[in-house]
Each structure stands twice: as structure tokens, then as C-alpha cells.
Interface confidence: low
Amino acid sequence: FERTRSLQDPCSNCPAGTFCDNNRNQICSPCPPNSFSSAGGQRTCDICRQCKGVFRTRKECSSTSNAECDCTPGFHCLGAGCSMCEQDCKQGQELTKKGCKDCCFGTFNDQKRGICRPWTNCSLDGKSVLVNGTKERDVVCGPSPADLSPGASSVTPPAPAREPGHSPQ
């Protein structure tokens, strides 16, 4: 089949890194600078992606593969192939339309990206709060009071966390 296809389409012989040049009797020409072809038999080479502005080059473009970008410090990738860079926030914050804002009471974010998520509701699993949540950390659930049999060492929840964070109560 491959031999048959080659007889029918001379371009199929052109390897990655080249293109089938119609202007030169369909001979295989190397991709020009700043372009690439990642598969054989291509009639054109694709323009290399340029990592500009908030993007920075993670992998240089070659004749057979596109450049790969990531984001400059303070930003992180979003989308397939890092198609966008989004501003980092601190732990305990989320990115809003008005910039980085502290997580509100009852929510937390332990990463520099993403949104503030609600604390775990321990009571849904029949448990109690062992360690209170903060804007950077979820609550830690512990055994319910009923699980602590008489004579067993009881767990006393600590006083509510009051480290700088963000709490609208």
C-alpha cells in the first residue's frame, strides 16, 4: 500500500521537517526558518509559535516540532498547549474580575490558581471539626463525639483559627 501510494503521490515521500514544493516539481524542500512540519507528506510548513510578552519559550521550535511556551513568573498556563497565561494569586486568594482577592470566610484555596472552595462540611459525614479551616487550608474532620467511647481520650477542637486570613462573619 505504501509503495502504491508513493507511486500515486510523490509528496508522501517528503519526511517531517520538509514540505512538498509544488513550485519545484513537487520535490521535498526543507522548511524555511521559523516554520516546521511535524509529519511527512505535508504540502506546507506551519509557522512556529512565538512565545512573546507574558509567554516564555519552554522549547525552541525545530524543523519538525513547534515551539512550546509556558508563562513568565507570576502567571500560570491555561488551555491546551498553554494557549493563555493567567495571573497567579497567593494561597488564600482567588483571581476575580477585579484582581486577586482574599478568600472569604468558609472558603479556602491552597494553590496560586483556581477559585476559593468551600470548607468541607464534616457533619455531612457524621464527623466533627478537628482543626478549623483557614483561607489557605480546608478544615480537618475528626471522629464524631459519639465515636469517642467513655474513657477514651477525647479530642477537643482548638480555638477558632485567627491567623490573618479572610472571614466575613
Epitope: Q93, T96, K98, G99, C100, K101, D102, C104, F105, G106, T107, C116, W119, N121, S123, V129, N132, G133, T134, K135, V139, P160, A161, R162, E163, P164, G165, H166, S167, P168, Q169
Partner: antibody
């Protein structure tokens, strides 16, 4: 329509305690945070502390730490603020205020009518 | 602990613009709320999340927040705007109010 109805005015002696209640109606009580804010005569607003009933976790301003206790009773949709070791400087109007916990960011969207606490010997 | 600083008073002629400031360290990272309080009444939310206006608040009331200063702006001031205005943020799990600004309409 959400309403926060507070208990009536109180006159207390120095060194005693006062417990003010705040009954909520017209909303899902446990899903919101309730704060207590006080205002001394001719002075500004001062946040004392608050609680999210669903978590039962209370947080307090450092100034009131150890002297204020905020609790909530989900069965009656009522929040309570107890202030102990009263002194004359605690004479103020005490407000409860609801914070919409299911929206971001949080702000006080509904307020009680206020409870005047007078501390006098 | 976090502190918010407001001018104690501001006097503005009717029809002019009042700008009430609220200063705080990197206040930009916080969501600033503004409340209006008239004598004998509970406070009323007039701006949330820096610049969002609750329903019923006129368009001439606006808010902004950048750097170390948040600002409440009331354009075309009316006699009914005379009140105390408080900014408020959350710092950690603690609510913080500014000292309040008494707006007088001349």
C-alpha cells in the same frame, strides 16, 4: 423578605453579663454567617465576631477575645452574643448582621434593628 | 491587626461630588464594602466588592479600589446623602471597619 429581629434593650451592672439574641426569618439560616457589630454612643461601627451556623465555628475580634461568646441555634434560626465582665465602655447599640455566605465576596446585606445595652451602676 | 483610615468629616455643596477615601495597606487585595448610616438607623450597604451597587442604590454612587486606597464617590450630592459612611473589609477571619466619615451637605 429576610428579617433579623433582636431582643430588647438591657440595663446591666458593671461586672455582669448580657446575652442578646437575633432571630432570622425568610432565609436559610444555617447557610449564612451572622456577625455582631456594636456602636458606642457617637462612635463608629466595631466588629465583635461572627459565626457560620453550618460550621458552628465562631471567630472573634482580638479586643473581645475571652469576653464574648457567639453561638447559634439552627433549630430556632437564632444567633446569640454573650458579653461578660461588662464595663461602662460596653454601653452601646449591638447589631446582628447577616453575611450572604453563598455569594462572593461577603458583605452585610441585612441588619437587625439594634439592641441598646446600658452598663451602669 | 489591619487598620482602615477614613477622614472624620467631609462637607460638600449640593450638586457637587463627594469623594470619601478609605486607606489600608494593600487594600487592593481586599474586597471593600461601603455602608451608609443615618442617625437612629442600622447601616445600609451602598457598595460591595469595591464597586458593585446593590439594587436600589442610585447610579451616582460608585466605588473604586486600587493600591492602598479605596474611594466612595457620590456625584451630584443631595441633602438626603447626609450621613455617616463606613468602609469595611475582611482581614483573615476578622471584620474591620473604618472609623467612619460624616458627610455634611452644605
Amino acid at each position: 423578605q429576610v428579617q433579623l429581629v433582636q431582643s430588647g434593650a438591657e440595663v446591666k451592672k458593671p461586672g455582669s453579663s448580657v446575652k442578646v439574641s437575633c432571630k432570622a426569618s425568610g432565609g436559610t439560616f444555617s447557610s449564612y454567617a451572622i456577625s455582631w457589630v456594636r456602636q458606642a454612643p457617637g462612635q463608629g461601627l466595631e466588629w465583635m465576631g461572627g459565626i457560620i451556623p453550618i460550621f458552628g465555628t465562631a471567630n472573634y475580634a482580638q479586643k473581645f477575645q475571652g469576653r464574648v461568646t457567639i453561638t447559634a441555634d439552627e433549630s430556632t434560626s437564632t444567633a446569640y452574643m454573650e458579653l461578660s465582665s461588662l464595663r461602662s465602655e460596653d454601653t452601646a447599640v449591638y447589631y446582628c448582621a447577616r453575611v450572604g455566605r453563598l455569594e462572593r465576596p461577603y458583605y452585610f446585606d441585612y441588619w437587625g434593628q439594634g439592641t441598646l445595652v446600658t452598663v451602669s451602676s | 491587626s489591619y487598620e482602615l483610615t477614613q477622614p472624620p468629616s467631609l462637607s460638600v455643596a449640593p450638586g457637587k461630588t463627594a469623594r470619601i477615601t478609605c486607606g489600608g495597606d494593600n487594600i487592593r487585595s481586599k474586597s471593600v464594602n461601603w455602608y451608609q448610616q443615618k442617625p437612629g438607623q442600622a447601616p445600609l450597604l451602598v457598595i460591595s466588592f469595591d464597586s458593585d451597587r446593590p439594587s436600589g442604590i442610585p447610579e451616582r454612587v460608585s466605588g473604586s479600589n486600587s493600591g492602598n486606597t479605596a474611594t466612595l464617590t457620590i456625584s451630584t450630592v443631595e441633602a438626603g446623602d447626609e450621613a455617616d459612611y463606613y468602609c469595611q473589609v475582611w482581614d483573615g477571619y476578622v471584620g474591620v471597619f473604618g472609623g467612619g466619615t460624616q458627610l455634611t451637605v452644605l
